[in-house]
Amino acid sequence: LIIGFGISGRHSITVTTVASAGNIGEDGILSCTFEPDIKLSDIVIQWLKEGVLGLVHEFKEGKDELSEQDEMFRGRTAVFADQVIVGNASLRLKNVQLTDAGTYKCYIITSKGKGNANLEYKTGAFSMPEVNVDYNASSETLRCEAPRWFPQPTVVWASQVDQGANFSEVSNTSFELNSENVTMKVVSVLYNVTINNTYSCMIENDIAKATGDIKVTESEIKRRSHLQLLNSKAS
């Protein structure tokens, strides 16, 4: 969480951002809030990016003002206009690119004053893993697959019964480059699994951590997946 305060001149207002991560090819949110102001006509929201000449986005006098927008963001940005008076200056970024990573500034002017806060935005690829029983294998085998990751993650297996056990000797992980030549498909196979146990396949890079669980019993198979973004610090 980054909390910024206004500069000299008129009163300062508090602006708060949250460091976040964007998933390449999908839409992302750069989060920014400020002290609410009912006078929409007086609110100016400017998003800037370090090292970029033009603006990322500008909203003023109740509408988008994109004449100064940098080419790399053309047609890809939007604020939540109907939420501005309650202090929401968050930016929606369409079709996140690897090059969108960097330091952004959310700069706000209202009838009460000015303020700004920085935000670190990471980009990469992350996806939910799915763990299945591999019936084609000669022994009891589990297969963990996740379609899109970048940068290359680590994969670790764990089990409820054998807590703390190292499965690196009985697992094999491969990374296959996807067609767009950036993201990769992750496939990890765990051998010699036992029945009536819960196994977890944990995939992690510096952006996200995802876990796929599978519980195999005589009568049923239960699955559960979970994904969490790392380093979501507010400013």
Epitope: I38, K39, K63, D82, I85, V86
Partner: antibody, heavy 117, light 107 residues
Amino acid sequence: EVQLQQSGTVLARPGASVEMSCKTSGYTFTGYWMHWVKQRPGQGLEWIGTIFPGNSDTNYNQKFKGKAKLTAVTSANTAYMDLSSLSNDDSAVYYCTMGLRTWLDYWGQGTLVTVSA
Amino acid sequence: DIQMTQSPASQSASLGESVTITCLASQTIGTWLAWYQQKPGKSPQLLIYAATSLADGVPSRFSGSASGTKFSFKISSLQAEDFVSYYCQQFYTTPWTFGGGTNLEIK
């Protein structure tokens, strides 16, 4: 489901003060502006002002400054409006109203204030 | 303050007819305008927001349009329950202001 429940009809003497309430449910009370609107019998709508319960920030129509006072009790999810120095001109229905997306999508049923000697 | 001049103040029409109400803002308000319907003894109800968007659950015979500072509200085929009052309102700047209202009467 968002609901705004206003207090009942008030009969008051000229020069007196009245307080009316607007009890809310179904949304985060502290996160949205609560507005108050006046409607005299057979007349149009007038915006009195608004309060942001999260920080008690207010904005009044100049015409109602000194006449209306807006407050909010976040623990009770309730907004209040005090009207002071009542005169016949203050006889009206008063609405609390709010919008989850700026415009006023939700309205209370109104509180009728009658000022009479 | 921004003045919202609504016309006509009242209008007579027949069932099935179309009617158009206009609101003229005294200065630019973008598309920060809403239209409300009010039935006798009831609270106003949002019909149109952001000048042209239909609120949830509102029949498609209601529509809004915008051209600069002139805003129009149309009911395409009047039903019996439509003969009530209508108001426009700007929420671009404070004080938020309403038009004077239009009372629709059955001919």
